[in-house]
């Protein structure tokens, strides 16, 4: 049986970005018809992970997995089920807690983003890493880059691959 | 609010292993009082990720996140809720689908393990990577190493940090 997953294309893109794999990122972005400016924006984020080395990939992957498997995300599934007691209401949508984290990463202040990460993983080294990545992204990305990244995320969330 | 997570120490260990970070692995293993033979076993698994390079860390992190956020794992939460319509029945236990994958990684055949991964992520590159890692683990780990890894996993699953 092939299991339905929670927005697989999102995780494909996230892991390609976080692990600095440009070829994998290009492949994933092609699947959602990313424009050139959207690709540029994602590559700037990828550069931040690469510059901050292996530890940043470990820790941010850990944060993403922790949020994705947290009660917040589980709670989404639970809410749907409570409403009509049928498992098949459980969509493949990305969990709002994940979406919120990504939005804050792009448009929030460093404090807002770190505060959201701290709800899931309060280890000082994780929070320090989150702040470094956020500061890097703010330094590298113009407002337009961030808008392009958000428009790409909308494509991802509404893609048939999600 | 600090959210309860699904067995955080498990993901700490998994990401430390998969990302080849020996210091992080040692820190995580100390938290669950790992014995020397258990550490040796985990370091052999870590060697496989390191030897297979960045792509293996990307892809296996992706598989783990995909399974952890799949309907199978969400379904666990849903089941609990359907039974008594209370969100707080949602435990911090590791999802059985994740547990099953790890067990097959250690004690199953390569075909059995790849088949289980394919239920969540059927990309050929992902499955090829899963097979390479599984073959590597089978080549490096003695039967006793595998038993030590399983005993460490039991410590993790029953730890107060899970």
């Amino acid at each position: 049986v092939k299991m339905a997953e929670t927005c697989p294309i999102f995780y494909d893109v996230f892991f390609a970005v976080a692990n600095g794999n440009e070829l994998l990122l290009d492949l994933s972005l092609t699947k959602v018809n990313a424009t050139e400016p959207e690709r540029t924006a994602m590559k700037k984020i990828q550069d931040c992970y690469v510059e901050n080395g292996l530890i940043s990939r470990v820790l941010d992957g850990l944060v993403m997995t922790t949020i994705s498997s947290s009660k917040d995300c589980m709670g989404e599934a639970v809410q749907n089920t409570v409403e009509d007691l049928k498992l098949n209401t459980l969509g493949r949508e990305i969990c709002p807690a994940v979406k919120r984290g990504v939005d804050l990463f792009l448009t929030g202040t460093p404090d807002e983003y770190v505060e959201q990460v701290a709800q899931y993983k309060a280890l000082p080294v994780v929070l320090e890493n989150a702040r470094i990545l956020k500061n890097c992204v703010d330094a590298k990305m113009t407002e337009e880059d961030k808008e392009n990244a958000l428009s790409l995320l909308d494509k991802i969330y509404t893609s048939p691959l999600c | 609010v600090k959210m309860a997570e699904t067995c955080p120490i498990f993901y700490d260990v998994f990401f430390a292993v998969a990302n080849g970070n020996e210091l992080l692995l040692d820190l995580s293993l100390t938290k669950v009082n790992a014995t020397e033979p258990e550490r040796t076993a985990m370091k052999k698994i870590q060697d496989c990720y390191v030897e297979n390079g960045l792509i293996s860390r990307v892809l296996d992190g992706l598989v783990m996140t995909t399974i952890s956020s799949s309907k199978d794992c969400m379904g666990e939460a849903v089941q609990n809720t359907v039974e008594d319509l209370k969100l707080n029945t949602l435990g911090r236990e590791i999802c059985p689908a994740v547990k099953r994958g790890v067990d097959l990684f250690l004690t199953g055949t390569p075909d059995e393990y790849v088949e289980q991964v394919a239920q969540y992520k059927a990309l050929p590159v992902v499955l090829e990577n899963a097979r390479i890692l599984k073959n590597c683990v089978d080549a490096k780990m003695t039967e006793e190493d595998k038993e030590n890894a399983l005993s460490l996993l039991d410590k993790i699953y029953t730890s107060p940090l899970c």
Epitope: - | P37, K44, D47, E51, T107, G108, C136, A139, K140, T142, E143, E144, D145, K146
Partner: antibody
Framework: QVQLQQSGPGLVKSSQTLSLTCAIS??????????WNWIRQSPSRGLEWLGR?????????DYAVSVKSRININPDTSKNHFSLQLNSVTPEDTAVYFC???????????WGQGTLVTVSS | DIVMTQSPDSLAMSLGERATINCKSS????????????LGWYQQKPGQPPKLLIY???TRESGVPDRISGSGSGTDFTLTISSLQAEDVAVYYC?????????FGGGTKVEIK
């Protein structure tokens, strides 16, 4: 046909280091489907496994608890041999020492001829 | 460590007779994941190294005569020589290889009566 040829001194003084070498022909020390072992045999202890080295993209060693603090087994890929070093020997270490190949890390399918090592006090 | 106990210590039989050697392990050497018994049998003649006869409890090594066979599972194993020959005079050892520390039985000496 795999052959193992042992060499090293037959007499070692107490508290010194016992050193033996096992030369391999017909196989490679860095083969990834075998392990290279040292075993000893004495009337008091019978057959006693001491340790092994094996290559699986990198080198690994396992040692018997009874000798762990004073044993070293080292491969030499350039000479296609592996060696045993046992430090701080006592008369109880007097035995016939064998090198042997294990398929994977399982049964011992090829053995060296054995070397009687006497530790004198 | 797994302790291997052999019985009897010695065995004196007539040529052509059936010789049976027992080996008991202190823990099971059956690995549940592949259903294999991690046990071997060796023959050692005076002044020679041990020679592998049987592995996986019952698989004969090439060149070993078929009058020699191994059986058993879990903790109890047997080496049988169906018709004893003069060249079978030796000491026989069982060995487990399930654990990282390999261990041997104390040996059974087979002689001609």
């Amino acid at each position: 046909q795999v052959q193992l040829q042992q060499s090293g001194p037959g007499l070692v003084k107490s508290s010194q280091t016992l050193s033996l070498t096992c030369a391999i022909s017909g196989d490679s020390v860095s083969s990834n489907s075998v392990a290279w072992n040292w075993i000893r045999q004495s009337p008091s202890r019978g057959l006693e496994w001491l340790g092994r080295t094996y290559y699986r993209s990198k080198w690994y060693n396992d040692y018997a608890v009874s000798v762990k603090s004073r044993i070293n087994i080292n491969p030499d890929t350039s000479k296609n041999h592996f060696s045993l070093q046992l430090n701080s020997v006592t008369p109880e270490d007097t035995a016939v020492y064998f090198c042997a190949r294990a398929w994977n890390w399982y049964y011992l399918d090829y053995w060296g001829q054995g070397t009687l090592v006497t530790v004198s006090s | 460590d797994i302790v291997m106990t052999q019985s009897p210590d010695s065995l004196a039989m007539s040529l052509g007779e059936r010789a049976t050697i027992n080996c008991k392990s202190s823990q099971s050497v059956l690995y549940s994941s592949n259903n294999k018994n991690y046990l071997g049998w060796y023959q050692q003649k005076p002044g020679q190294p041990p020679k592998l006869l049987i592995y996986w409890a019952s698989t004969r090594e090439s060149g070993v005569p078929d009058r020699i066979s191994g059986s058993g599972s879990g903790t109890d194993f047997t080496l049988t020589i169906s018709s004893l020959q003069a060249e079978d005079v030796a000491v026989y050892y069982c060995q487990q290889y399930l654990r990282n520390t390999l261990t041997f039985g104390g040996g059974t000496k087979v002689e001609i009566k």
